[in-house]
């Protein structure tokens, strides 16, 4: 049985160095922006659209939205990549939770928020299950003071 | 309406301590990071510490570190910024300063003014 | 540690007229989540900083709309699209991808 273990961490490790976790990201951290604009922005004040991260065309990063997507369409372009790489560990629940700890990791110094942390938490719980796949019964999502550094 | 109010501040000599205080009122203290920002008179602004809303985190400019200490009660609604070995390039002005919980400084204070001078 | 440099560090500008702050930082400053971690702020003569542009091209609420942010990476602009005298005091952009780090700042004044 440990045998059996030890073969599925390395199967877990491997297909986490694979995944390209990004995608899932870009899209958890625009829902969290863009309920931060509407919530603190003065509706009398027109301003740049606020649902797509801010990218010169010219040096794009190969992830990331393109400058002209409008109104959230960036982030349902985000969301389907992202469930096709959480597909990936739609057999191995405990892999599927490691694939979720990632991502709070690498996104937890960005939240210097309490409510801003919990939502990105809530909308991580939840992204399995608006993938259609199966949420990982016990995750914790807690991480260490300040997260890791991800640039 | 965001309300950040230091104080604390005024003439020191150098090589002593002086603690800075900062109320806020007008938003959920407790669930936002909190940071103190400086200007030296005539000069831009400079970064010194910031606090993560549980404490959790602690971030200081290498300008100030090991000499500055930053904290919080989150029942007082109150930063504080203990500054201890004091040099001449402290003198500044000091912003108590919100974070919007995404790294943006949202709302500052109107400073409180540290001179260190023999 | 991440460097800001900011030009011009003086600006002399026609009430009416467009204007243009430039931003530079030694590294990147574009996160994987696809934000660009760089704020601009202004500083009116005897005020507090005030929050004028977040994550590069986000306007913070209440500012006008003749002022916008663009850019990505290492090089960011703040334009100001008709000057008015309200808008002189100095303009500093902030990154805030590692800790933070401010501009020297760009003093914008009346010709």
């Known amino acids: 049985r440990q045998q059996w273990e030890l073969q599925g961490d390395r199967r877990c490790q491997s297909q986490l160095e694979r995944a390209n976790l990004r995608p899932c990201e870009q899209h958890l951290m625009q829902k969290i922006q863009r309920d931060e604009d509407s919530y603190g922005r003065d509706p009398y004040s027109p301003s740049q659209d606020p649902y797509s991260p801010s990218q010169d065309p010219d040096r794009r990063d190969p992830y990331s939205p393109s400058p002209y997507d409008r109104r959230g369409a960036g982030s349902s372009q985000h969301q389907e990549r992202c469930c096709n790489e959480l597909n990936e560990f739609e057999n191995n629940q405990r892999c599927m939770c490691e694939a979720l700890q990632q991502i709070m990791e690498n996104q937890s110094d960005r939240l210097q928020g309490r409510q801003q942390e919990q939502q990105f938490k809530r909308e991580l719980r939840n992204l399995p299950q608006q993938c259609g796949l199966r949420a990982p019964q016990r995750c914790d999502l807690e991480v260490e003071s300040g997260g890791r550094d991800r640039y | 309406e965001v309300q950040l109010v230091e104080s604390g501040g005024g003439l020191v000599q150098p090589g002593r301590s002086l603690r800075l205080s900062c109320a806020a009122s007008?938003?959920?203290?407790?669930?936002?990071?909190m940071h103190w920002v400086r200007q030296a008179p005539g000069k831009g602004l400079e970064w010194v510490s910031s606090?993560?809303?549980?404490?959790?985190?602690?971030d200081y400019a290498d300008s100030v570190k090991g000499r500055f200490t930053i904290s919080r009660d989150n029942a007082r609604h109150s930063l504080y910024l203990q500054m201890n070995s004091l040099r001449a390039e402290d003198t500044a002005l000091y912003y108590c300063?919100?974070?919007?919980?995404?790294?943006?400084?949202?709302?500052w204070g109107q400073g409180t003014l540290v001179t260190v001078s023999s | 540690d991440i460097v800001m440099t900011q030009s011009p560090l003086s600006l002399p500008v026609t009430p009416g007229e467009p204007a243009s702050i430039s931003c530079r930082s030694s590294?990147?400053?574009?996160?994987?989540?696809?934000?660009?971690?760089l704020d601009w702020y202004l500083q009116k003569p005897g005020q507090s900083p005030q929050l004028l542009i977040s994550?590069?091209?986000n306007r913070a609420s209440g500012v006008p709309d003749r002022f916008s942010g663009s850019g990505s990476g290492t090089d960011f602009t703040l334009k100001i699209s008709r000057v008015e005298a309200e808008d002189v005091g100095v303009y500093y952009c902030?990154?805030?991808?590692?800790?933070?780090?401010f501009g020297q700042g760009t003093k914008v004044e009346l010709k």
């Open positions: 007008g938003f959920t203290f407790d669930d936002y990071t």
């Open positions: 994550l590069a091209s």
């Open positions: 300063v919100k974070d919007n919980g995404l790294r943006t400084l949202d709302f």
């Open positions: 590294q990147s400053l574009l996160h994987r989540n696809g934000y660009n971690y």
């Open positions: 606090i993560r809303w549980n404490s959790g985190n602690l």
């Open positions: 902030m990154q805030a991808l590692q800790t933070w780090t």
